[in-house]
């Protein structure tokens, strides 16, 4: 190598990461196997759960503003879940990115796209509910499914825009032990006259901007919307939170718990540029909190189901009935199970004034099983607690 050979310029923290070597420690290998297993399971669960949510909410329910929000959240989570198998592969081959630079950029971008999209969509849901309560007349006139879709498109565009720097500055870096990292390289584009200054300013800018835009601002919007709604409903003498409120509260709590640690470590990482003593903590903690953030996409569909009232009781009670009705022949569909469903349907209709499904006919065979898997939320049109939970938006 010549004296002036251009080594790829790396920020100090990144160069030090490239110097970390793998251990052949047995206990560490067991942890790696467990991590691969856990991420593989999460990949599968995330894809199936979010796929089912998209199918049921998108195809088997009448489209409302609320189902639109859930649909887009599930789409974001499905994208993230679809990228998880590649992260699992990265873990399986010994924490080495073997899929090339372009795919490294794309894979990482999906993670950040999900981060921004989730934050923005949860903000929109909270603002939507706030407007319904604080400006009911305006909401009545302007709150349409088409408008919600347009808002979602704008939010997706904003999320994509915010993801661009993460796409640009993602790179594959060879470690000294032969493994390949897929990580930030903020010196990749126009490093400027002073690398140290560029490293510091860009790392801080990325960490602070994502913390503010994808976490703090959305949580502030959610909190202030909730406060405004609570104040208004207090005046109306309402005490018990509605079903949709519980669903949103659960999803927001999961968002805060899953993404909060990631942002803390991301800020610590930016601080570690000037304070190398923080680096070991960041190196140890970041993989765990990144996985936790990924798992948010797996947790959300579970929350949609679990926030259905009487869910577990209904599941236990209807297990035998559902299995019977799924296994009966199409010619036998006029029997007792069917009439029992029709009775439930009428009570559900009286419980919620809204028609909740775009298909009036009884779903058959696999569709019914899918519905049951979702906790009877969409097993038959216009029944099911999820339908009601997703509809009673002002409660």
């Amino acid at each position: 190598m010549s004296a002036n050979a251009t080594l790829k310029p790396l920020c100090p923290i990144l160069e030090q990461m490239s110097r970390l070597q793998s251990h052949s420690n047995t206990s560490i290998r067991y942890i790696d196997h467990a991590a691969v297993l856990l991420h593989g399971l999460a990949s599968l669960l995330g894809l199936v759960e979010n796929g089912v949510i998209l199918f049921v909410v998108g195809c088997r329910m009448r489209q409302t503003v609320v189902t639109t929000w859930v649909l887009h959240l599930a789409l974001s989570d499905l994208l993230a879940s679809a990228s998880l198998p590649f992260f699992t592969y990265f873990l399986a081959v010994g924490h080495s990115w073997e899929l090339g630079t372009t795919f490294c950029k794309l894979h990482s971008s999906i993670f950040f796209l999900n981060m921004f999209a989730s934050g923005f969509l949860l903000s929109a849901i909270s603002l939507d509910r706030c407007l319904q309560v604080v400006r009911p007349v305006w909401a009545q006139n302007h709150r349409t499914v088409a408008a919600a879709h347009k808002v979602c498109l704008v939010l997706w565009a904003l999320a994509v825009l915010n993801t661009v720097p993460y796409f640009v500055f993602r790179d594959t870096i060879s470690r000294l032990d032969g493994r390949i990292m897929c990580y930030y390289n903020v010196l990749l584009l126009n490093p400027g006259p002073d690398r140290d200054a560029t490293c510091n300013s860009r790392q801080v800018a990325l960490a602070v901007s994502k913390f503010l835009l994808a976490f703090l601002v959305p949580l502030a919007i959610i909190a202030s919307s909730h406060a405004a709604v609570s104040l208004r409903l207090q005046h109306r003498g309402r005490r018990r939170p509605g079903r949709f409120v519980r669903l949103v509260a659960a999803v927001v709590a999961a968002f805060a718990l899953c993404w909060g640690p990631y942002h803390v470590f991301s800020l610590l990482e930016a601080r570690a540029h000037a304070n190398p003593g923080l680096r070991p903590l960041v190196w140890r903690g970041l993989p765990f909190v990144t996985s936790l953030a990924f798992f948010n996409s797996v947790a959300n569909p579970v929350l949609y189901v679990l926030t259905c009232p009487d869910m577990l009781r209904k599941l236990r009670r209807s297990l035998r009935t559902v299995l019977e009705s799924v296994l009966v022949d199409d010619s036998e569909l006029g029997g007792a199970g069917s009439s029992r469903r029709r009775r439930t349907s009428s009570t559900a209709r009286s419980a919620s004034p809204l028609a909740l499904c775009s298909r009036p006919e009884e779903p058959r065979g696999p569709a019914r099983l899918l519905g049951w898997l979702l906790g009877s939320c969409a097993a038959s049109p216009q029944t099911g607690p999820l339908n009601r939970a997703l509809s009673s938006t002002s409660s």
């Epitope: 004296a3 100090p12 160069e15 002073d194 003593g277």
Partner: antibody, heavy 118, light 107 residues
Framework: EVQLVESGGGLVQPGGSLRLSCAAS????????MSWVRQAPGKGLEWVAY????????DYPGTVEGRFTISRDNSKNTLYLQMNSLRAEDTAVYYC???????????WGQGTLVTVSS | DIQMTQSPSSLSASVGDRVTITCRAS??????LAWYQQKPGKAPKLLIY???QLASGVPSRFSGSGSGTDYTLTISSLQPEDFATYYC?????????FGQGTKVEIK
């Protein structure tokens, strides 16, 4: 060929000042971080100052902080070390060294001797 | 500050001998260690960087190993030109400190 040539050493009284220079050639000076390292007669090596490639970041060990100042002029391909309030224990051969990347001194000058004595 | 303790401080060996010099840091330095060779009246020369990586133009008889706090420089077959003083230096947290040196002399 990479060359680092130090100059400015000499005899100085305790409490006095001295400015060392290091002329660089054979590489793109503005692309590399630089350091000064010293070696007291018959003793080991001691790192004394660091400066980033653009000059925005400097660092010093506690033994010289506040007394020594590292700087660079990328247009002149020159590194400097301003030494104030010199003490007898600062007597050493001072080397300028180029950082391979962020660390690791891959090229050194031949050194200049600084003697602090009354 | 991180202390670097080199051992032995001096050793006598013959041409063709296998020589091992160790360097212990007072805390984990995560492979951020370099080894230098210095001959009398000359500037130090980089041999090994990042604990295990051979610097450009350095003969393959030199090798580095170790992790955490303990690192080793090995000369597999000592040559006449290898009689010199060897220093380790960490690049973890500033101040970047050197070991006190190991003088390799002819037996």
């Amino acid at each position: 060929e990479v060359q680092l040539v130090e100059s400015g050493g000499g005899l100085v009284q305790p409490g006095g000042s001295l400015r060392l220079s290091c002329a660089a050639s054979g590489f793109t000076f503005s692309s590399y971080s630089m350091s000064w390292v010293r070696q007291a007669p018959g003793k080991g090596l001691e790192w004394v100052a660091y400066i980033s490639n653009g000059g925005s970041t400097t660092d010093y060990p506690g033994t010289v902080e506040g007394r020594f100042t590292i700087s660079r002029d990328n247009s002149k391909n020159t590194l400097y070390l301003q030494m104030n309030s010199l003490r007898a224990e600062d007597t050493a051969v001072y080397y300028c060294a180029r950082h391979r990347t962020n660390w690791d001194f891959d090229y050194w000058g031949q050194g200049t001797l600084v003697t602090v004595s009354s | 500050d991180i202390q670097m303790t080199q051992s032995p401080s001096s050793l006598s060996a013959s041409v063709g001998d296998r020589v091992t010099i160790t360097c212990r840091a007072s805390e984990n330095i995560y492979w951020n260690l370099a080894w230098y060779q210095q001959k009398p009246g000359k500037a130090p020369k980089l041999l090994i960087y990042a604990a295990t990586q051979l610097a450009s133009g350095v003969p393959s008889r030199f090798s580095g190993s170790g992790s955490g706090t303990d690192y080793t420089l090995t000369i597999s077959s000592l040559q006449p030109e290898d009689f010199a003083t060897y220093y380790c230096q960490h690049f973890w947290i500033t101040p970047w400190t050197f070991g006190q040196g190991t003088k390799v002399e002819i037996k």
